[in-house]
């Protein structure tokens, strides 16, 4: 009867995590391997050998211009080159893109910016999380949001600390204030407007998110910390 | 010599000439065949948002959705039954969870709370198999032998596992796998 | 205000039948599992069973399986605990608790419990 | 299944005091561990769950840590209500289990 079990909530579905994205490997250089032969051509056909030193007397008398038919030629050759390399990129890209069902339709929202977020971070709701699992205290916890290029966690609205709330458990928040006679700020400076449980005690000068509600806590002691930045 | 220098780059021109009409011809079929095939999808779903990324082939999430490892959740904060979990998914073109390994939700191993997944016992393949007709690997849940046959399974990130009443309501999360 | 309140309590033989009710209030009774936890005189505490939000799925401590049986009237915000073939050892305080909103293995509130006696 | 093993049994202390009660637990169960407070006649009264998080409407004074198999429930400032019987239980698996309870008396 060792049933593992505790709780209410939610599930989904799976692949390796480990597994390497597919990129398009290769293209750049088959691209410009190709590229490189074609100026191969390209360039023999502009250095005649010494079997045409005749032609070459013929430019002289002709004040050294070339004749229309290798001008026009050599048009064709540069428009040959950019149309292979356009067809080379588009045979490499588009079964990239079919893949990842990248097309103006799948845009379903207003556009925004792409998520850009670092592996193994989340993207919720236009903003990247990193989810801690070490303890630090709210300042070393700050710190570590900062060498990461990102902010300690911030709350900005009721549905986002439900959802928080729903995957984490307690974590620093980026909220203090300098004693219980200050105000609590955000780590920007600005006012805090929430409410904050157990204010009045004045030890407890940093605060935590705690299932779906914000409370004081000590800033020296050690807590989990989660990070986030917007895009 | 002259007029057969002229006549040797006219051919060259003319050659060159068709090689652009074929290369013009073949990049437009190409093009055309491409936006056909990607247009196909209808104009509005309901489910992720895909945008691919400058940096990477992980692609962003609709509003509400959660983006990990190239994958989409949705984690609802309503409990439903497994049947009615496994038909709000499929109405956001997603699926109930489909696990090939425990890790797959490492950012939720914190959580205490379980969630249907899409795991249910087939009686005509005597197994128990996951929405997409594959069977469960004997090594994701060591208990799974002890499952009561006739019970949907839910499932904490935590790794834990059990066996309930498909009628119980439990919370769930819908997946959308991006590549 | 969250309310659970027990009873069918009271002296029964060994080998003979009880039936304890809970009714709550104050909250949704239909979205969270229920349990009963019991407290023998001057012993500390044990989990009886559980029973999840809409009743399908049942849990037993070993010591109850088989003798025991927990149920739910969801229409009725009520938490019975049929319990049969009662021995001496039975004899406990039994409190109905309600599982937290956050984990349903936490028992957030608690009733006021009530006292079963077997004793010949 | 899953024991739980309280330490100490019995602690006296006074009105002001730092109390520290320790759980540990056969096994690992990461951090589905609960704090009860019991007081002579009344039900239990749940102070901290998922190890560190603590319940809605208790003082800030009780505070709980430790993950995996050791678990250490603190009171920072001992009130005199806080005199009780203190119980640790698991809930990560069936059958749920609590420790056999360690009791605060007043020095």
């Known amino acids: 009867m060792n049933k593992q079990r505790g709780t209410f909530s939610e599930v989904s579905l799976a692949q390796d995590p480990k597994r390497q994205q597919r990129k398009p490997k290769g293209n750049k250089s088959s691209i410009s391997g190709t590229e490189q032969e074609i100026f191969q051509v390209e360039l023999n056909l502009q250095n005649p050998s010494l079997n045409h030193q005749g032609i070459d007397k013929i430019y002289d008398c002709q004040g050294l211009l070339p004749p229309p038919e290798k001008l026009t030629a050599e048009v064709l050759g540069i428009i040959c080159i950019v149309l292979m390399a356009t067809v080379l990129k588009t045979i490499v890209l588009i079964p990239f893109l079919e893949q990842n069902n990248f097309s103006p339709n799948t845009r379903t929202q207003k556009a925004r910016h792409c998520g850009h977020c670092p592996e193994e971070w989340i993207t919720y709701s236009n903003s990247c999380y990193y989810i801690g699992k070490e303890r630090r205290t709210w300042e070393e916890s700050l710190l570590a949001c900062t060498s990461k290029n990102s902010s300690l966690l911030s709350i900005d609205n009721e549905e986002e600390m439900k959802f928080l709330a729903s995957i984490l458990p307690s974590s620093w928040i980026g909220v203090f204030r300098n004693s219980s006679h200050h105000p609590w700020v955000t780590i920007n400076g600005l006012a805090f407007k929430h409410k904050i449980k157990d204010s009045d005690n004045a030890e407890l000068n940093c605060a935590v998110l705690q299932v779906n509600r914000l409370k004081s806590a000590q800033c020296g002691s050690s807590m989990i910390y989660h990070c986030k930045h917007k895009l | 010599m002259a007029v057969f220098k002229t006549t040797l780059w006219r051919l060259i021109s003319g050659t060159l000439g068709i090689i652009c009409l074929s290369l013009m011809s073949t990049l437009g079929i190409l093009l055309k065949n491409s936006f056909t095939k990607l247009s196909i999808e209808p104009a509005f779903t309901p489910g992720p948002n895909i945008e691919l990324q400058k940096d990477s082939d992980c692609c962003s999430c609709q509003e509400k959705w959660v983006g990990y490892r190239c994958n989409c959740y949705f984690i609802s904060s309503e409990q439903k039954t497994w049947n009615e979990s496994r038909h709000l998914c499929a109405s956001q073109k997603s699926s109930l969870l489909q696990l090939q390994n425990t890790d797959e939700l490492d950012f939720m191993s914190s959580s205490q709370q379980f969630y249907w997944i899409g795991l249910s016992y087939s009686e005509e393949h005597t197994a128990w198999l996951w929405e997409n007709g594959s069977a469960l690997s004997q090594y994701l849940f060591p208990s799974f032998e002890t499952f009561n046959t006739k019970n949907c399974i839910a499932y904490n990130p935590n790794g834990n596992a059990l066996d309930e009443s498909c009628e119980d309501k439990n919370r769930y999360i819908c997946k959308q796998q991006l590549i | 205000e969250v309310q659970l309140v027990e009873s069918g309590g009271g002296l029964v033989q060994p080998g003979g039948s009880l039936r304890l009710s809970c009714a709550a209030s104050?909250?949704?009774?239909?979205?969270?599992?229920m349990n009963w936890v019991r407290q023998a005189p001057g012993k500390g505490l044990e989990w009886v069973s559980t029973?999840?939000?809409?009743?399908?799925?049942?849990y037993y401590a070993d010591s109850v399986k088989g003798r025991f049986t927990i149920s739910r009237d969801n229409s009725k915000d009520t938490l019975y605990l049929q319990m049969n073939s009662l021995r001496a050892e039975d004899t406990a305080v039994y409190y109905c608790?309600?599982?937290?909103?956050?984990?349903?293995?936490?028992?957030?509130?608690w009733g006021q419990g009530t006292l079963v006696t077997v004793s010949s | 299944d899953i024991q739980m093993t309280q330490s100490p049994s019995s602690v006296s202390a006074s009105v002001g005091d730092r109390v520290t009660i320790t759980c540990r637990a056969s096994q690992g169960i990461s951090s589905w561990l609960a704090w009860y407070q019991q007081k002579s006649g009344k039900a239990p009264k749940l102070l901290i769950y998922a190890a560190s998080s603590l319940q809605i409407g208790v003082p800030s004074r009780f505070s709980g840590s430790g993950s995996g198999t050791d678990f250490t429930l603190t009171i920072s400032s001992l009130q005199p209500e806080d005199f009780a019987t203190y119980y640790c239980?698991?809930?990560?698996?069936?059958?749920?289990?609590f420790g056999q309870g360690t009791k605060l008396e007043i020095k």
């Open positions: 239980q698991q809930a990560n698996s069936f059958p749920y289990t």
């Open positions: 104050g909250f949704t009774f239909s979205s969270y599992a």
């Open positions: 029973i999840s939000n809409s009743g399908g799925t049942t």
């Open positions: 608790a309600k599982a937290h909103y956050y984990a349903r293995g936490y028992f957030d509130y």
